[in-house]
């Protein structure tokens, strides 16, 4: 059964962007792939992007860029102002789903309050399965 | 352009293990993955596996789970394929490959290659 | 796992000819599938990515088309420097290669 995993990096010289990355183990056909955030602008889930195999992408602000990594894991680039970043960042879960063949919907979110200052440390995520 | 320069020739007995490097100079090297292909001699190509440096995180074929392991050492700008238990038949030469694509969509390539590290496997 | 299978296996064939190689996948690969050449003691070169793409600096006697399960790499005029062995390569779960057809001088 394929795996998800999220990881968020900070860039050390720009505080106010960061860039999502999350991927899946295993073998399994990637149909769609959607990153999203909770916490982040209000109290409920933002859709930031949306990647398809083959219709290519399409992301929602503070996404900046959103893009396959590899054929199994993408990446979204998010841009804001400097202070906003800092103060919401906080209490941010970033999540991201998987929808392959034959194993349906893969989930795996980053609880950032819980990772280390640097957001980069490549803490297991949460793993959630709904098929 | 990214370059990627594959370690020298080895010699192993069966039994042991074999740990083979890559290292990419002149780009990213984060921000693709690395994929290990092999080929016996007078053989075809065999995928063996890649891993994606930011993360960590590494892929493997089927074939080759549990016997091989890919890691990457972003300071360094390394990959790594070791391989355990071998025998006779894996004596190739193993290649490692950048996966390249454009983005948008996932489409996905190798480009560049190493030059390729023999291993030969003998008692 | 997705299978690839290629054929010929080998072929001979003269300077100016027009070559036909085949990939078929065990299923349903969409546009994934790339092609490389490979001559003795170096590694191989991408040709075609996505099916039909030519990798820049490849001539443009070398065409890929094809999508779904059947696919085919064409050499429109063999010259010299073609003679070589060709591979397959899906990308669309992990990566597979087809076991090669080698071009040979007739």
């Known amino acids: 059964s394929p795996e998800v995993w999220v990881q968020v990096q900070m860039e050390a010289t720009n505080l106010s962007s960061f860039s999502v990355h999350c991927g899946v183990l295993g073998y399994s056909l990637i149909s769609l792939v959607t990153v999203s955030c909770e916490g982040f602008v209000d109290a409920g889930r933002t859709k930031l992007a949306v990647l398809h195999p083959e219709f290519g992408t399409q992301q929602w602000a503070p996404a900046r860029q959103a893009h396959w990594e590899t054929p199994n894991s993408v990446s979204v680039t998010l841009t804001m102002g400097q202070s906003k970043a800092r103060s919401s960042l906080a209490n941010t879960t970033f999540c991201c789903e998987f929808v392959t063949f034959p194993h349906g919907s893969r989930v795996a979110c980053r609880d950032l309050h819980r990772s280390d200052p640097g957001l980069s440390a490549p803490t297991p995520a949460l793993n959630l399965q709904a098929d | 352009q990214v370059q990627l320069v594959q370690s020298g020739a080895e010699v192993k007995k069966p039994g042991s293990s074999v740990k083979v490097s890559c290292k990419a100079s002149?780009?990213?090297?984060?921000?693709?993955?690395i994929s290990w292909v092999r080929q016996a001699p007078g053989q075809g190509l065999e995928w063996m596996g890649g891993i994606f440096p930011i993360s960590g995180h590494a892929n493997y074929a089927q074939k080759f789970q549990g016997r091989v392991t890919i890691t990457a050492d972003e300071s360094t700008s390394t990959a790594y394929m070791e391989l355990s238990s071998l025998r006779s038949e894996d004596t190739a030469v193993y290649y490692c490959?950048?996966?390249?694509?454009?983005?948008?969509?996932?489409?996905?390539?190798?480009?560049?290659w190493g030059q390729g590290t023999l291993v030969t496997v003998s008692s | 796992d997705i299978q690839m299978t290629q054929s010929p296996s080998s072929l001979s064939a003269s300077v100016g000819d027009r070559v036909t190689i085949t990939c078929r996948a065990s299923?349903?690969?969409?546009?994934?599938l790339n092609w490389y050449q490979q001559k003795p003691g170096k590694a191989p070169k991408l040709l075609i990515y996505a099916a039909s793409s030519l990798q820049s600096g490849v001539p443009s006697r070398f065409s890929g088309s094809g999508s779904g399960t059947d696919f085919t790499l064409t050499i429109s005029s063999l010259q010299p420097e073609d003679f070589a062995t060709y591979y397959c390569?899906?990308?669309?779960?992990?990566?597979?290669f087809g076991g090669g057809t080698k071009v040979e001088i007739k």
């Open positions: 390569q899906q990308s669309d779960i992990l990566y597979t």
């Open positions: 002149g780009g990213t090297f984060s921000s693709a993955a």
């Open positions: 299923q349903s690969i969409s546009s994934y």
């Open positions: 490959a950048r996966d390249t694509g454009r983005g948008y969509t996932r489409h996905f390539w190798f480009d560049p």
